[in-house]
């Protein structure tokens, strides 16, 4: 004597007032769980949206974006533009990141350049509004007695010459 | 808890109100409570269901319905009518939430 | 009306032993509503399994259901003396006349 609303299964809502206690999701719906009182309705990909998957009477249908926008949110909620990398999406919208910052993706704001100084690293590859500094080595790690990456080339034997 | 009362010896013909009164559950709130009798030395006959706190339609096997009336009627009973009785519907009857709590049961008799 | 033949009526077993008792519906039971009852002379009936093979609780592992559709089976295994008790099978049907039947019973006795 199971409640059988509660065991009506996903895809279907409990309609206990027609001659079926459990009836399938109408076209448009969904329930994603089982006891359902009514289906949700699904979610329409519209304008600046596209349907990545179609819904089915147990799941919602997903939505992406057109070529030249990024999802944002959960669930993919918000559309947003795309900007080229070197870029960042304001108000007034695309503009370039200002002397001292990048951005290498084409969504997100401009990030300042590393500060190699910082960790007593030289710059060793100037930052663009692309890409960031590359720091290169301390100058501790240059000086004489410091542990090289290279190993040093063996001597040669005397009285042998190439052959 | 669940305690069915109103059981009792009638004539045929007759009409009856049994009663399930709950203890510790509150009928205001969405229960699935049913009516189950069995005729002595006889098996399981399952009579009809209601959900408490709810308008929604009741559940009844088809010889049932027209002469049992399942109904909430207040916030710890839910009462089954009988109408119209006759010798076999003799028989223990029991109040139950869900198939997982029982009552003890009411016995009808009905009898010239 | 939906019609529940459960089989077999009577079972005579061993201490220690397995029953099997068989549920056949003349319909198919909607998302397995399906639950198996044990009763006791005198007391109401206990659920054991919902859902066609969901244990209730406080209820042991030795009692074990499966099946969908029209047929399902209440195994019983390593069988105490008071698993002594007749056992109904009830179905559910997505109709709100006639949602539920009860099978006829099957009374388990020790030999």
């Known amino acids: 004597l199971q409640d059988p609303c509660s065991n009506c299964p996903a895809g279907t809502f409990c309609d206990n007032n027609r001659n079926q206690i459990c009836s399938p999701c109408p076209p448009n719906s969904f329930s994603s769980a089982g006891g359902q009182r009514t289906c949700d309705i699904c979610r329409q990909c519209k304008g600046v949206f596209r349907t990545r998957k179609e819904c089915s009477s147990t799941s919602n249908a997903e939505c992406d974006c057109t070529p030249g926008f990024h999802c944002l949110g959960a669930g993919c909620s918000m559309c947003e533009q795309d900007c080229k990398q070197g870029q960042e999406l304001t108000k007034k919208g695309c503009k370039d990141c200002c002397f001292g910052t990048f951005n290498d993706q084409k969504r997100g704001i401009c990030r300042p350049w590393t500060n190699c100084s910082l960790d007593g690293k030289s710059v060793l590859v100037n930052g663009t509004k692309e890409r960031d500094v590359v720091c290169g080595p301390s100058p501790a790690d240059l000086s004489p007695g410091a542990s090289s990456v290279t190993p040093p080339a063996p001597a040669r034997e005397p009285g042998h010459s190439p052959q | 808890s669940l305690e069915e009362s109103g059981g009792d010896l009638v004539k045929p013909g007759a009409s009856l109100t049994l009663t399930c009164t709950a203890s510790g559950i509150d009928f205001s709130r969405r229960y699935y409570m049913c009516w189950v009798r069995q005729a002595p030395g006889k098996g399981l006959e399952w009579i009809a269901c209601i959900y408490t706190g709810s308008r929604d339609t009741p559940h009844y096997a088809s010889w049932a319905k027209g002469r049992f009336t399942i109904s909430q009627t207040s916030s710890t009973t839910v009462t089954l009518q009988m109408t119209s009785l006759t010798a076999a519907d003799t028989a223990t009857y029991f109040c139950a939430r869900e198939g997982s709590l029982w009552g003890q049961g009411t016995l009808v008799t009905v009898s010239s | 009306a939906q019609v529940l033949t459960q089989t077999p009526s009577s079972v005579s077993a061993a201490v220690g032993g397995t029953v099997s008792i068989s549920c056949q519906s003349s319909q198919s039971v909607y998302s397995n509503w399906f639950s198996w009852y044990q009763q006791k002379p005198g007391q109401p009936p206990k659920l054991l399994i919902y859902?066609?093979?969901t244990l209730a609780s406080g209820v042991p592992s030795r009692f074990k259901g499966s099946g969908s559709g029209t047929q399902f089976t209440l195994t019983i295994s390593d069988l105490e003396c008071d698993d002594a008790a007749t056992y109904y099978c009830?179905?559910?049907?997505?109709?709100?006349?006639?949602?539920?039947?009860f099978g006829g019973g099957t009374e388990v006795e020790f030999k």
């Open positions: 009830a179905g559910g049907y997505n109709t709100v006349i006639d949602t539920f039947a």
């Open positions: 859902s066609a093979s």
